[in-house]
Interface confidence: low
């Protein structure tokens, strides 16, 4: 029995619902009474949801899963996962048994956009050209880990004196803090870009130092 799932991972935003697609080809005369369907976590074999003896056996996964009962007879064994969490990320296997048996695994990639970075400057007053300043770029509650890049006002990458830390909160979302130490020129703009590698989504922050006062666009 051929069971089909998408090759590419299913990307789902934290808090949204995701559909893990799975389909099979029912033979003529197929009845749901013949169908045994099991969704489980690929790695741990934990049961997620099942259908057997013509009945939806329900969710075994925090009551956040559902099948599409009206579509099962057409060979649609997809699983709806509600209110996606970081911890849901991974591989799910769809097992279908009628007379023959088939299975396939689909990957769920969880993502969350990063907030617009906030920029802080230390010291933040009485600055002169030649002073060393520390610029901190902070962005919150994204997933997965961010790519953090710095550049100057001309678009030149600044990679020399950068320290980036990423801490996961209790939901598994990351807060990122990137620190750039730089010697001030006469004036200048310093930009931080926080990139979500899955969503290919950027969040920008910048600070412009023009003697006094500083501006934080």
């Amino acid at each position: 029995l051929e069971v089909q799932v998408p090759e590419d991972p299913v990307v789902a935003l934290v808090g949204t619902d995701a559909t893990l697609c799975c389909s099979f080809s029912p033979e003529p005369g197929f009845s749901l009474a013949q169908l045994n369907l099991i969704w489980q976590l690929t790695d741990t074999k934990q049961l997620v949801h099942s259908f057997a003896e013509g009945q939806d056996q329900g969710s075994a996964y925090a009551n956040r899963t559902a099948l599409f009962p009206d579509l099962l007879a057409q060979g649609n064994a997809s699983l709806r996962l509600q209110r996606v969490r970081v911890a849901d990320e991974g591989s799910f296997t769809c097992f279908v048994s009628i007379r023959d048996f088939g299975s396939a695994a689909v990957s769920l990639q969880v993502a969350a956009p990063y907030s617009k970075p906030s920029m802080t400057l230390e010291p933040n007053k009485d600055l002169r050209p030649g002073d060393t300043v520390t610029i901190t770029c902070s962005s919150y509650r994204g997933y997965p880990e961010a790519e953090v890049f710095w550049q100057d006002g001309q678009g030149v990458p600044l990679t020399g004196n950068v320290t980036t830390s990423q801490m996961a909160n209790e939901q598994g979302l990351f807060d990122v803090h990137s620190v750039l130490r730089v010697v001030l020129g006469a004036n200048g703009t310093y930009s931080c870009l926080v990139r979500n590698p899955v969503l290919q989504q950027d969040a920008h922050g910048s600070v412009t130092i023009t003697g006094q006062p500083m501006t934080f666009p």
């Epitope: 710095w150 990458p157 990137s178 290919q200």
Partner: antibody
């Protein structure tokens, strides 16, 4: 300029695991903004990206190799490593470690490469 | 994945003459931040690749100004204004817009 040097066995038997290490000098893996990568080149062929790791442990792998590849980092030794399981002759290649610079997504520094032959 | 197609695959050039290599992408490499994520690398015989051009047209540190990158969207060109003997090797374009990062198949530049 940062230096990268690959090390590991040049010969691996089919079905076994290929293990390589890249040692970074004149620069710290722990500095942000860089992604420590593996790229390979089959004999007489082009370049294939395998994956990368960020110093904090975040990884990203090529989908075609994802099921067989693991990249890890040891910041205390300033090293990162590649493991490729269940190798076949098709995995015979020169393996390069490289540093990907953040803003440009470019591989700005490369190791000299190490030829790994898969053969019994 | 994004496919990069280079042409020509072989390029014989007389020293002092210009050379041009084309790289075509299966989708636009211009990202919403305004950057074009295309690089050029040179792999000299028996060596690892070296970084030439990043973000479409920016020369890497130490790269002679006879090398220039141009193009936008899906069509890109690497130009060498006056080829020198030390420029021989295989030139690769690479997209850094999205994973998996992919390379063109390479253009072998040789001296006539």
């Amino acid at each position: 300029q940062v230096q990268l040097v690959e090390s590991g066995p040049g010969l691996v038997k089919p079905s076994q695991t290929l293990s390589l290490t890249c040692t970074v000098s004149d620069g710290s893996i722990s500095s942000g903004g860089y992604y420590w990568s593996w790229i390979r080149q089959h004999p007489g062929k082009g370049l294939e990206w395998i994956g990368y790791i960020y110093y904090s442990g975040g990884t990203y792998y090529s989908p075609s190799l994802k099921s067989r590849v693991t990249i890890s980092v040891d910041t205390s030794k300033n090293q990162f490593s590649l493991k490729l399981t269940s190798v076949t002759a098709a995995d015979t290649a020169v393996y390069y470690c490289a540093r990907r610079a953040g803003y440009s997504s470019s591989f700005d520094s490369w190791g000299q490469g190490i030829l790994v032959t898969v053969s019994s | 994945e994004i496919v990069l197609t280079q042409s020509p695959l072989s390029l014989p050039v007389t020293p002092g003459e210009p050379a041009s290599i084309s790289c075509r992408s299966s989708q636009s490499l211009l990202y919403s931040n305004g950057y074009t994520y295309l690089d050029w690398y040179l792999q000299k015989p028996g060596q690892s690749p070296q970084f030439l051009i990043y973000l479409g047209f920016n020369r890497a540190s130490g790269v002679p100004d006879r090398f220039s990158g141009s193009g936008s969207g899906t069509d890109f060109t690497l130009k060498i204004s006056r080829v020198e003997a030390e420029d021989v090797g295989v030139y690769y374009c690479m997209q850094g817009l999205q994973t998996p990062y992919t390379f063109g198949q390479g253009t072998k530049l040789e001296i006539k």
